[in-house]
């Protein structure tokens, strides 16, 4: 029979390659039975995970699963790093695996002088 424990389906060692300046939604797939748990996001800083208090989040409900979404509008270069979601369920803290965002800063890449510009200097 199906377990009624809360499950957080973030894949171990999962990675997302994203561009600075773009919007991005980081999803934490949450499976629960009756009452939706309280879910939060945090960002890893060494071995500690710093809670993301003032960030926009939302829920998306699907038939068999719900998603707790962390919004990046837009993605900034310092959003690079590893994130984890956690749920409070029946006074237990359930933690997901971490997922890593690799942010490419296209702006700084495009601002580098071209070969022609370098030659003319």
């Amino acid at each position: 029979k199906e377990s009624c424990d809360v499950q957080l389906y973030i894949k171990r060692q999962s990675e997302h390659s994203i561009l600075a300046g773009d919007p991005f939604e980081l999803e934490c797939p949450v499976k629960y039975c009756a009452n939706r748990p309280h879910v939060t996001w945090c960002k890893l800083n060494g071995t500690t995970c710093v809670k993301l208090e003032d960030r926009q989040t939302s829920w998306k409900e699907e038939k068999n699963i719900s998603f707790f979404i962390l919004h990046f509008e837009p993605v900034l270069p310092n959003d690079n790093g590893s994130y984890r979601c956690s749920a409070n369920f029946q006074s237990n803290l359930i933690e997901s695996h971490s997922t890593t965002l690799y942010v490419t800063d296209v702006k700084s890449a495009s601002e580098r002088p071209s070969k022609d510009e370098m030659a003319s200097r």
């Epitope: 499950q7 389906y9 973030i10 990675e15 997302h16 359930i94």
Partner: antibody, heavy 121, light 112 residues
Amino acid sequence: EVQLQQSVAELVRPGASVKLSCTASGFNIKNTYMHWVKQRPEQGLEWIGRIDPANGNTKYDPKFQGKATITADTSSNTAYVQLSSLTSEDTAIYYCALTYYGSSQHYFDYWGQGTTLTVSS
Amino acid sequence: DVVMTQTPLTLSVTIGQPASISCKSSQSLLDSDGKTYLNWLLQRPGQSPKRLIYLVSKLDSGVPDRFTGSGSGTDFTLKISRVEAEDLGVYYCWQDTHFPQTFGGGTKLEIK
């Protein structure tokens, strides 16, 4: 109930390519990793690589880099491995395996029944 | 790559007797998240592999409690308290801590 459906057998000429498929039912592959594993006759298991169908990210064992290409189609809930420049060394059973991660860390939970690939002229 | 060495290669056991398989890894399988990603699989004759144990000692659903997994670091053991006829096949240890994932060479359990 989760099932992974693979074709039973393929016979291919040396030098040719082949694309093996693995269709999942009872589970959305976007929430999983899909792995491919090789087993040569009377031998052990070798991990070829895996795909994250949610974003197409792949990881390969370096010894299969250039030999195998793993793809996935989330609309048909199917993962594929394409094997190129086939030789007799590629004659084996190829298993797909579905890994999913919940908070209790499940992985390699389901295996297909395997496709027997024979490379022969 | 992490080398997984299983012993013995073949194990011949009388039904009702215990059995033990050893698996040693060439480096520690303790991950940075504090978990040890060591699994045991059973491949019955003519079938695909089926996972029995994950995270060293957690039994998959439907796996009888006569199976136990133990160990840490580089040394791991699968024990069957009383072997039954359905237990015959090839047992593999498999690690998913380090990239690439690697399997042991297998231990064939046969019934005496």
